[in-house]
């Protein structure tokens, strides 16, 4: 009778042991599936966000602060005030951001068209030299592939030319301390998509 | 992707005017601007100017100046040209071409002019 | 303004020839090159700015170098998709111009 008892409660473990590990995939599988679902929701999320932004160069689910542009995966913003290129280094450091970096040509080709100026204003990049005659590296210490654009030496600045600014799509080297427009750029957020939310009432008022 | 998709041809009356558009899709108009370039009938390609998508101040080469309005609609992602009292050689394709005026990565299909009485 | 000469006009070739086609610039225009390939009734397609930097897409077949005044367009080994006219263009600054165009032709 005892014997028979103890093996029902065996038994009675074994299987809830059983059901323990059956349920613990369960759930490892939907973390897994929610995880998946998460990622997905994310893209679909960036996707419309993106073609929304596009629409109207703005909206509120952009991932970028107010006022910065969402170009690719990076928020810019493109300012009026002046300054040396270590000031424009700081005041991005402060504004969370570094300075504007070209990865690609798209990169350039926006940058061109976001600094192109009938007033002939030229804006820094996070390009130096860090040695005058040395090679060109970004803030970040990644080397300058010279494929992306060609830096214009510029023969009028009197004293080393180790800073580059962009010029209505052109490049040049500068003298650091030579007053320039500040372009900071830092990584775009994610996109949250509760602020894809359309209420109602608003569906089907034009596109 | 990225699209420029431009207005249908157009035959006009010398004196005329016409306005072509240029309807951008796949990215954020804002960020890039857009030129126009002509290009007559057998000839080559003439950079006409370009208008800054941010601002809307047009910009315009020397030859284009007078009869030729570059002006935008940003809300629906489309940029037009507008040419007023046309005359016989005005007649060619004017294709619009997104970006600074630098080099031109995206085209639109072109749109023929023709003025003839 | 900068004006841009491109040489020769037209050019006939076959299949699997390399084919070089010049461009020269009025004054320097360091590497603020693009180069571009027309068909009939079709847009212009862009091919290298940079004077030497291949638009993604474009076969390695096409290369391009120079800098300063002159520039070549370089086609290693022409295919049949190649034939048609090809013009450079000046990116230093406003207002942009184009060569006049080079027409290959089959020969």
């Known amino acids: 009778q005892y014997y028979q008892l103890s093996n029902t409660g065996q038994d009675t473990i074994s299987q809830m042991e059983e059901r323990l590990g059956n349920t613990s995939q369960e759930l490892q599988s939907l973390q897994v599936q929610n995880i998946k679902l998460a990622g997905s929701l994310q893209h679909v999320a960036e996707k419309l966000c993106r073609e929304l932004y596009n629409k109207a160069g703005a909206h509120r689910c952009s991932p970028c602060t107010e006022q910065w542009k969402w170009h690719g995966d990076n928020c810019y913003q493109f300012y009026k005030d002046s300054k040396s290129w270590e000031d424009c280094k700081y005041f991005c450091l402060s504004e969370n951001s570094t300075m504007l970096k070209i990865n690609k040509q798209e990169d350039l080709e926006f940058a061109a068209s976001q600094s192109y100026s009938e007033f002939f204003y030229s804006y820094w990049t996070g390009l130096l030299r860090p040695d005058s005659g040395k090679a060109w590296l970004w803030m970040d210490g990644t080397p300058f592939t010279s494929e992306l654009f060609h830096i214009i030496i510029d023969v009028t600045s009197p004293r080393s030319r180790d800073c580059v600014a962009i010029l209505n799509g052109m490049i040049f080297s500068k003298d650091c301390k030579e007053l320039k427009r500040c372009v900071c750029e830092r990584r775009a957020g994610m996109v949250k998509p509760e602020s894809l939310h359309v209420p109602p009432e608003t569906l089907g008022e034009g596109d | 992707q990225i699209q420029l998709v431009q207005s249908g041809s157009e035959l006009k009356k010398p004196g005329a005017s016409v306005k072509v558009s240029c309807k951008a899709s796949?990215?954020?108009?804002?960020?890039?601007?857009m030129n126009w370039v002509r290009q007559a009938p057998g000839q080559g390609l003439e950079w006409m100017g370009w208008?800054?998508?941010?601002?809307?101040?047009?910009t315009y080469a020397d030859d284009f100046k007078g009869r030729f309005v570059f002006s935008l609609d940003t809300s629906v992602s489309t940029a037009y040209l507008q040419i007023s009292s046309l005359k016989a050689e005005d007649t060619a394709t004017y294709f619009c071409?997104?970006?600074?005026?630098?080099?031109?990565?995206?085209w639109g299909q072109g749109t023929t002019v023709t003025v003839s009485s | 303004d900068i004006q841009m000469t491109q040489s020769p006009s037209s050019l006939s070739a076959s299949v699997g020839d390399r084919v070089t086609i010049t461009c020269r610039a009025s004054?320097?225009?360091?590497?603020?090159l693009a180069w571009y390939q027309q068909k009939p009734g079709k847009a212009p397609k862009f091919l290298i700015y940079?004077?030497?930097t291949l638009a993604s897409g474009v076969p390695s077949r096409f290369s391009g170098s120079g800098s300063g005044t002159d520039f070549t367009l370089t086609i290693s080994s022409l295919q049949p998709e190649d034939f048609a006219t090809y013009y450079c263009?000046?990116?230093?600054?406003?207002?942009?111009?184009f060569g006049q165009g080079t027409k290959l032709e089959i020969k």
């Open positions: 796949g990215y954020t108009f804002t960020n890039f601007g």
């Open positions: 263009q000046h990116h230093f600054g406003t207002p942009l111009t």
């Open positions: 208008i800054n998508t941010n601002t809307g101040e047009p």
């Open positions: 071409a997104r970006g600074a005026p630098a080099w031109f990565t995206y």
């Open positions: 004054e320097s225009i360091y590497s603020y």
């Open positions: 940079n004077a030497k």
